[in-house]
């Protein structure tokens, strides 16, 4: 980047150009380059208390190049800016500042958020989730048969994780009560996949109750249609007491 730096080495009068090194067109013993060869940029480099003129093929980081008819000059970016395109447009801010449309800011505007990796004001990204996958087979202790009420679960994927200011993700797991099919379990039938059996539709007085998984965020939010009527619960208890047939289960 800082190719073809020129500085004189032999003692000579300030404005004499012969003997100038590298890209210098004119130079002085004390100030280094005073002007540059065509297409090169003139920049001042601080060395201790002294400022020395140098000629560069491109401007260093923290400076931008301007071409004038008589000279191509490197000019320092604004104090809060690390690299800039021109005097009005910063392309990378110094630590503690965030870039927004070419300017360095302490805080990002509303509707944008600060990205501490890129040090830019960026779009707020909200959570995005997929559609629900189908309900899993109805199981009770891993079994898909018997007279017991079990549970079934469904899941959905997070397509887009939210950024710091983005909306949180809704539940990605949901569980609800269901009725395991009314038949005796055959030997080795435990955990049979639901696609191999018909899922029993609930009786008139039995609604399925969906409960978001305890891991998920909005588990406390109750959906009205998922609430079970107290009378229906009592009715089922009575029905269950009347079933005196014992069911053999394989554990």
């Amino acid at each position: 980047q800082n190719a073809s730096r020129g500085r004189r080495q032999r003692r000579m009068h300030p404005n004499v150009s012969q003997g100038c090194q590298g890209g210098c067109a004119t130079c002085s013993d004390y100030n280094g380059c005073l002007s540059c060869k065509p297409r090169l940029f003139f920049a001042l480099e601080r060395i201790g208390m002294k400022q020395i003129g140098v000629c560069l093929s491109s401007c260093p980081s923290g400076y931008y190049g301007t071409r004038y008819p008589d000279i191509n000059k490197c000019t320092k970016c604004k104090a809060d800016c690390d690299t800039c395109f021109n005097k009005n447009f910063c392309t990378k801010c110094k630590s503690g500042f965030y870039l927004h449309l070419g300017k360095c800011l302490d805080n990002c505007p509303e509707g944008l958020e600060a990205n501490n990796h890129t040090m830019e004001c960026v779009s707020i990204v909200h959570c995005e989730v997929s559609e629900w996958n189908p309900w899993s087979p109805c199981t009770k202790k891993g079994k898909t048969c018997g007279f017991k009420r079990g549970t079934e679960t469904r899941v959905r994927e997070i397509i887009q994780h939210p950024s710091a200011k983005g909306n949180l993700c809704p539940p990605t797991n949901e569980t609800r009560k269901c009725t395991v099919q009314r038949k005796k379990c055959q030997k080795g039938e435990r955990g049979k996949k639901g696609r191999e059996r018909k899922r029993k539709k609930p009786n008139k007085g039995e609604s399925k109750e969906a409960i978001p998984d305890s891991k998920s965020l909005e588990s406390s939010k109750e959906i009205p249609e998922q609430r079970e009527n107290k009378q229906q619960q009592k009715k089922r208890k009575v029905q269950d007491k009347q079933k005196s047939v014992s069911v053999s289960t394989v554990h």
Epitope: F85, N88, F89, L101, G102, P109, G111, L112, V122, S123
Partner: antibody, heavy 117, light 107 residues
Framework: QIQLQESGPGLVKPSESLSLTCSVT?????????WNWIRQFPGNGLEWMGY???????NYNPSLKDRISITRDTSKNQFFLKLNSVTAADTATYYC??????????WGKGTTVTVSS | DIQMTQSPSSLSASVGERVTITCRTS??????LAWFHQKPGKSPKLLVY???TLADGVSSRFSGSGSGTQYSLKINSLQPEDFGNYYC?????????FGGGTKLEIK
């Protein structure tokens, strides 16, 4: 040099979706800042609709948030506007524009969309 | 949303005159304000950004000024090609709203 060109149907029926394409030449849509959609109503008022940024993230005008979607196809160097459930009030000239460091702001020529049955 | 109040909504001026259009914002836009010129049937063209920076290729007859909530666009020595509509737009908080426009006509 960089150029933007809008395209899409000039007539859309009420309650249907409006879909427009902005084709970009002379610059990659994965560079630059924000690739915008702006519309101008028959009375000349301008409305910023939203953008897709160089990294694919979006920002939309809250007044359109439930109906608008801006996506892109980086392989074709195009970005798209989809506006759902349109009404006669969405009749306008639609412009795509870009905010860049070098040029700061460049607009396409615009495409007129009429919403009518 | 930040409201943009542009004034006047229309004005008539003669070639060679100097005119000023103002844009007032409902809250500070921290100089993230641009001015556009639009001729009939054409797309808007950027004149000024960051409140006072002249866009590439724009005549020095145009100048932007202001800060906070008050901004203005001055046109020195009006030329025939300057007539048309002028709009301000802020690029601060989302959404980036436009002013209602100023129609500049030949007297």
């Amino acid at each position: 040099q960089i150029q933007l060109q809008e395209s899409g149907p000039g007539l859309v029926k009420p309650s249907e979706s409006l879909s427009l394409t902005c084709s970009v030449t002379g610059y990659s849509i994965t560079s630059g800042y924000y690739w915008n959609w702006i519309r101008q109503f028959p009375g000349n008022g301008l409305e910023w609709m939203g953008y897709i940024s160089y990294d694919g993230t979006n920002n939309y005008n809250p007044s359109l948030k439930d109906r608008i979607s801006i996506t892109r196809d980086t392989s074709k160097n195009q970005f798209f506007l989809k506006l759902n459930s349109v009404t006669a009030a969405d009749t306008a000239t639609y412009y795509c524009s870009v905010l860049l460091i070098q040029y700061f702001n460049i607009w396409g020529k615009g495409t007129t969309v009429t919403v009518s049955s | 949303d930040i409201q943009m109040t542009q004034s006047p909504s229309s004005l008539s001026a003669s070639v060679g005159e100097r005119v000023t259009i103002t844009c007032r914002t409902s809250e500070s836009v921290n100089n993230f304000l641009a001015w556009f010129h639009q001729k009939p049937g054409k797309s808007p063209k950027l004149l000024v950004y960051h409140a006072k920076t002249l866009a590439d290729g724009v005549s020095s007859r145009f100048s932007g000024s202001g800060s906070g909530t008050q901004y203005s666009l001055k046109i020195n020595s009006l030329q025939p090609e300057d007539f048309g509509n002028y709009y301000c737009q802020h690029f601060w908080s989302i959404p980036w709203t436009f002013g209602g426009g100023t129609k500049l006509e030949i007297k």
